[in-house]
Amino acid sequence: EPPTACREKQYLINSQCCSLCQPGQKLVSDCTEFTETECLPCSESEFLDTWNRETRCHQHKYCDPNLGLRVQQKGTSETDTICTCEEGLHCMSESCESCVPHRSCLPGFGVKQIATGVSDTICEPCPVGFFSNVSSAFEKCRPWTSCETKDLVVQQAGTNKTDVVCGPQDRQR
């Protein structure tokens, strides 16, 4: 892209190059032949995050507790507020405008990845040799009990939802 008539951090208006306002400030009046661009800081609840010629600052995002949101990072004059979800909830979308409860992994499934404020629980089916008999947002698939190490034998085979049942070995005399 070839260079334009005005330099970086300038804008072209009415045949003159005016300085853009720095992040955190809004445009009050364009420069003239005799005066510089006039900018004013954004108020406490507002921000602008780029070099700009905006006449209004943007409102900080509101983290609505009724939607399960809380402030992760307070906004400044140059940055927007960052919201995250309350414990046990995660964002519904990338913009995180509201939160939903974490998914629980049903029996037969274990937690592969625990949910965060921005991502839901990831479940995986319990492979052979592992089981989960609870609906949980935290529990991984657990290995079947090893009857042999307890000097016991398998009386009932395990499934993806149940542990094996161990019993005493038949002692034949």
Partner: antibody
């Protein structure tokens, strides 16, 4: 006082190119943009483009940008407009003007006639 | 691109009259509107910039008003020297555009 002195009238053949000059005086040449405009006989004005003599950066009217080239020589305080692949539609008076809150000062115009 | 419409292409008035020329933009251009005078010999001068600011050396008989889309150039106490074509031009958004012009004649 601010003055913009343009080069003299040109008679050129279709398909060729023309280069119009605009010598500025009476102010700091690098501090103001130079605008170029076209006026066909008995018609209104049409903007061609703008150049920053300080940086050499420019903006063009999309309608003409493939054929127009704006340049500036700081050492002689002169701006140039070159127009290529000329047709009869390019027969017009071409003006340069100093920027700074509109086209604040204008050259006297250069008549370009495209004719076989 | 932004269109500028000068509805009156020619206007006849008497010396000493007050004359108003209008210019309408196809969209809001705030106050980025300039007025020019082109004499019969082709020379062009800036009269007002930013809708109402009188350019240096321009007689105070010339005044400008308007903002947004509707703009007016007023010449009070018309003089012989004011015989010319008057153009408006917007400096809000590239490409810069001009009105079609209003030719002022003496009755």
């Amino acid at each position: 006082q601010v003055q913009l002195q343009q080069s003299g009238a040109e008679l050129v053949r279709p398909g060729t190119s023309v280069k119009v000059s605009c010598k500025a005086s009476g102010y700091a040449f690098s501090d103001y943009l130079i605008e170029w405009a076209k006026q066909r006989p008995g018609q209104g004005l049409e903007w061609i483009g703008v150049i920053n003599p300080g940086s050499g950066g420019s903006n063009y009217n999309e309608k003409i940008k493939d054929r127009a080239t704006l340049t500036a020589d700081k050492s002689s305080s002169t701006a140039y407009m070159q127009l290529s692949s000329l047709t009869s539609e390019d027969s017009a008076v071409y003006f340069c003007a100093r920027g700074g809150g509109g086209f604040t000062y204008w050259g006297q115009g250069t008549l370009v006639t495209v004719s076989a | 691109e932004i269109q500028l419409t000068q509805t009156t292409s020619s206007l006849s008035a008497s010396l000493g009259d007050r004359v108003t020329i209008s210019c309408r933009a196809s969209q809001d251009i705030s106050n980025y509107l300039n007025w020019y005078q082109q004499k019969p010999d082709g020379t062009i001068k800036l009269l007002l910039n930013f809708a109402s600011r009188l350019h240096s050396g321009v007689p105070s008989r010339f005044s400008g008003s308007g903002s947004g889309t509707d703009f007016f150039l007023t010449i009070s106490n018309l003089e012989q020297d004011d015989i010319a074509t008057y153009f408006c031009q917007q400096g809000s958004t590239l490409p810069w555009t001009f009105g079609g012009g209003t030719k002022l004649e003496i009755k």
